[in-house]
Interface confidence: medium
């Protein structure tokens, strides 16, 4: 062994995903999401599975409620460790409305631009996490069509927590979130009973995202 050899502590991805993907996670941060810690735990578990870097996978995060915020751009961080630190710091921005179409549309039009780090020829993946029917449902069909036209693969996650807590029917909500997912829906759509259960889908979601480059 060379005398200059050093042992360096680092976070190794749980499941190596060294493929090139540009992934934008679109998070519902409206008031009804609770507890927010469950969302950051989900992000942590998902992101630590990724090999993040300028030549590997890039991740950006957009949060929406009534308005949309770019939490960080695709090219903001160049390692998994940096992204994990940044994701833990994301605070819930709230909002009385769930503008899902606006969130997705902003991700498509802004987060996936070269100015924000998107790379030409690299597969685009969007992960949408929401807990309620959108207040801008009129635009949803159109916005999804626009994503389709730009070959953005979409994984959608329906959190049923607020519906279950209020003993409300989830049927219409689930149909809406299914409509967001790419085809085949059964491979791109997930639903969880509440926010705490988000972590239970990380392994399967991660495998399906990584399989896109296989």
């Amino acid at each position: 062994v060379s005398p200059t050899f050093q042992v360096v502590n680092s976070i190794a991805p749980v499941q190596e995903c060294s493929t090139q993907l540009d992934i934008v996670i679109v998070l519902d941060g409206s008031n009804s999401i609770y507890p927010w810690d469950s969302v950051t735990a989900f992000l942590n578990d998902l992101l630590e599975r990724m090999d993040i870097g300028p030549k590997q996978t890039q991740v950006g995060i957009v949060q929406y409620g009534e308005n949309v915020t770019h939490e960080f751009n695709l090219n903001k961080y160049s390692s998994t460790e940096e992204v994990l630190v940044a994701a833990k710091k994301i605070v819930q921005r709230g909002g009385r409305q769930t503008m899902t179409a606006l969130g997705i549309d902003t991700a498509r039009k802004e987060a996936f631009t070269e100015a924000r780090g998107a790379r030409r020829g690299v597969k685009k993946v969007m992960v949408i996490v929401t807990d309620g029917e959108s207040h801008d449902n009129h635009r949803l069909k159109k916005v999804i069509q626009d994503c389709e036209d730009e070959n953005i693969q979409r994984f959608s996650i329906a959190i049923l927590g607020s519906y279950n807590r209020g003993n409300l029917s989830t049927e219409k909500f689930v149909e809406e979130i299914k409509s967001i997912a790419s085809e085949p829906t059964e491979k791109h759509f997930f639903n969880v009973s509440d926010e705490l259960a988000l972590v239970t889908i990380v392994k399967t979601l991660g495998e399906r995202i990584f399989a896109l480059e296989a």
Epitope: E66, Q97, M99, D136, N137, H138, K141
Partner: antibody, heavy 120, light 108 residues
């Protein structure tokens, strides 16, 4: 300049169908959704639905489901709206309208001159 | 369906005066999806304001929009002769898209 030019006035009998055309010029036809809005004499505005000129995909207001058909011919940059089983209360001016998506998030920025459809 | 109620039905004012038009929604509307249009007799409507407060291209700065949630306002700071017309509000976020019944601004 950017404009939408619609076909001329129509007079129809109850039960018949009407097909109104809308020719776009001055912009990329397939780049913007087109909506149809109607206005009964002396009344307000009523949204009928939209067509995506790029894919041909449509979304109709529930009130008009089963009676309205929106189509397009990209080779001549023209959209069409056909309303069937006409009734006297369908008498209205029909407008085709462009929805601007990039800046305006689909507000209606360009309107056709309108086509008067009379059912009697 | 979101119902938009405009008031007053008619506003009688003189040129140079300030006009304040109200649009109230039956449920909350995002600012991003609220527009105002002007329509003159025999003409198609014209977009004035989008996103509740942004002026469309070529619209004079005497027109301004404000509001959020369920209450929105269009203000014309100093009425010009060409401003006497009917004004409609519209929400274009929730399906079906809906318009208010209109406010007519007429010369006193």
């Amino acid at each position: 300049q950017v404009q939408l030019v619609q076909s001329g006035a129509e007079v129809k009998k109850p039960g018949a169908s009407v097909k109104v055309s809308c020719k776009a010029s001055g912009y990329t036809f397939t780049g913007y959704y087109l909506h149809w809005v109607r206005q009964a004499p002396g009344q307000g505005l009523e949204w009928m639905g939209w067509i995506n000129p790029n894919s041909g995909g449509t979304n109709y207001a529930q009130k008009f489901q089963g009676r309205v058909t929106m189509t397009r011919d990209t080779s001549i940059s023209t959209a069409y709206m056909e309303l069937s089983r006409l009734r006297s209360d369908d008498t209205a001016v029909c407008y085709c309208v462009r929805a601007e998506d990039q800046q305006l998030l689909d507000a209606f920025d360009i309107w056709g001159q309108g086509t008067m459809v009379t059912v009697s | 369906e979101i119902v938009l109620t405009q008031s007053p039905d008619t506003l009688s004012l003189s040129p140079g005066e300030r006009a304040t038009l109200s649009c109230r929604a039956s449920q909350s509307v995002s600012r991003s999806y609220l527009a105002w249009y002007q329509q003159k007799p025999g003409q198609a409507p014209r977009l004035l304001i989008y996103g509740a407060s942004s002026r469309a291209t070529g619209i004079p700065d005497r027109f301004s929009g404000s509001g959020s949630g369920t209450d929105f306002t269009l203000t014309i700071s100093r009425l010009e002769p060409e401003d006497f017309a009917v004004y409609f509000c519209q929400q274009y976020g929730s399906s079906p898209l809906t318009f208010g019944g209109g406010t007519k601004v007429e010369i006193k």
